[in-house]
Interface confidence: low
């Protein structure tokens, strides 16, 4: 979860941020969509035992048991049906928590774009946040970090990635000469533009913030209908959603 060229945010000023942990370690980001729903990247959960997964809300310093933190297990995972691990296409999933978050100053919701919204245009100022390394050398951050980035022209980005991007991806650049952005383990965290979650951290290049391989996000606007369909199909009683993966070892 490396944010490069960023700054530490005011504690709990990004109350929608979720930390997804496996084996007690921060693994991916995500954002709180509803009191019981977190949106993240599908690739974060490849070959992962959901029974060992936790979602932490209301955090700033992950290594500290802050009184604002709320910790949940993962009740169900819904990965986009067209997710392709090799290409990162449709790299999005929904986590249903095993309890409802209590909303307050440190825990809040982030809205996705409207159903008919287009992605943010090239040059739009956005921000991306995460908890992991702040350099290529595994330097840990003091707390939640955030970098200010700008949306990159899709044609330019696609050329940089040798034509491997799809139309449901979104790219950012630093907007100046500094290296600024994310690295791979920031995955699932939101790209916030105009106060909406327009992107989900998906993949980047070998070196953090390298302009030759711009940061690539899942374009949330392309999946809004799917997101709300999954939420709508959810029943209030516990149990897996249709098409969802239940943590191994649990009975249906």
């Amino acid at each position: 979860a490396q944010i490069i060229g960023g700054h530490e945010v005011t504690p709990h000023s990004r109350p929608y941020m979720a930390s997804v942990r496996f084996g007690g370690q921060h693994h991916c980001g995500g954002f709180l969509l509803r009191a019981r729903w977190v949106v993240s990247a599908a690739h974060c959960f490849s070959h992962r035992d959901l029974r060992t997964g936790l979602v932490v809300l209301g955090a700033h310093v992950l290594s500290t048991a802050e009184p604002t933190q709320q910790v949940f297990g993962i009740d169900a995972l819904t990965t986009h049906p067209d997710y392709h691990p090799m290409t990162h296409a449709n790299d999005i999933c929904l986590l249903r928590l095993n309890g409802s978050a209590v909303l307050g100053p440190a825990v809040g919701l982030l809205r996705p774009p409207g159903r008919r919204a287009r992605p943010p245009t090239a040059g739009t100022r956005c921000r991306v946040a995460g908890w992991g390394f702040v350099s290529d050398f595994e330097e840990l951050p003091p707390g939640l970090m955030e970098a200010k980035v700008r949306v990159l022209d899709p044609d330019v980005c696609n050329s940089s990635w040798k034509g491997h991007l799809t139309l449901t991806m979104l790219c950012t650049r630093s907007g100046d000469s500094h290296r600024r952005g994310f690295c791979s383990a920031d995955s699932g965290g939101p790209l916030v533009c105009r106060n909406r979650a327009h992107g989900l951290v998906s993949f980047s290049g070998l070196w953090c913030g390298d302009p030759k391989t711009p940061d690539v996000y899942t374009q949330v606007s392309a999946f809004v209908a799917w997101i709300w369909d999954v939420v709508r199909r959810s029943s209030p009683q516990p149990g897996p959603l249709p098409g969802t993966t239940r943590p191994p070892g649990e009975a249906a």
Partner: antibody
């Protein structure tokens, strides 16, 4: 050279159907979107809908939703507009246009076909 | 839907005149506005995209400006081939919407 050529227009009775084609050449068909835009006689431009040929994603104007269907055949570099339950108010010249990404904007229609006239009348 | 309102709806001008057409969006559309030129019986042609970027091959006498809700297309010195109808279009949200057009006629 980028080219878009529409065909399939003509006279049709109210309630009837028509399928328009838009043959594209000179660019990578699957890397952009194709929009359909219409223009009633003496009137302005109205967006009808669009398709992303790479994955078949479509979007439509409310005025045609449920009646019109946009599709694409990437092997033929051709987009289609299937128009059902046609009404007199659908009478227009129908254009297809390439939708190009652009700096700080999406949805710029940089190349247009010559248009094909659809007349709905009894 | 976002409404795009052009003014004037028509204007008369002479060759060499400076012509300004304005377009107002019903809500903030950032700089996601394009301008098109259309001549009778022909398809529209892209002139300006992203509010101020001149499209390839378009003469430099055309320019665009604005952001947010107010946009302007300027023809610095009107030429005989510029007599046509001009449309603005927003591409900020779906559906893309056009202005009603401004017809530039010979005085």
């Amino acid at each position: 050279e980028v080219q878009l050529v529409e065909s399939g227009g003509g006279l049709v009775q109210p309630g009837g159907s028509l399928r328009l084609s838009c043959a594209a050449s000179g660019f990578t068909f699957s890397s952009t979107a194709i929009s359909w835009v219409r223009q009633a006689p003496g009137k302005g431009l109205e967006w009808v809908g669009e398709i992303y040929p790479s994955d078949g994603y479509t979007d439509y104007a409310d005025s045609v939703k449920g009646r019109f269907t946009i599709s694409a055949d990437t092997s033929k570099n051709t987009a289609y507009l299937q128009m059902n339950s046609l009404r007199a108010e659908d009478t227009a010249v129908y254009y297809c246009a390439r939708v190009k990404w652009a700096v700080s904007s999406l949805g710029v229609m940089d190349y247009w076909g010559q248009g094909t006239l659809v007349t709905v009348s009894s | 839907d976002i409404q795009m309102t052009q003014s004037p709806s028509s204007l008369s001008a002479s060759v060499g005149d400076r012509v300004t057409i304005t377009c107002r969006a019903s809500q903030d559309v950032s700089t996601a506005v394009a301008w098109y030129q259309q001549k009778p019986g022909k398809a529209p042609k892209l002139l300006i995209y992203s509010a101020s970027f001149l499209y390839s091959g378009v003469p430099s006498r055309f320019s665009g400006s604005g952001s947010g809700t107010d946009f302007t297309l300027t023809i610095s010195s009107l030429q005989p081939e510029d007599f046509a109808t001009y449309y603005c279009q927003q591409s900020y949200t779906t559906p893309p919407t056009f202005g009603q057009g401004t017809k530039v006629e010979i005085k």
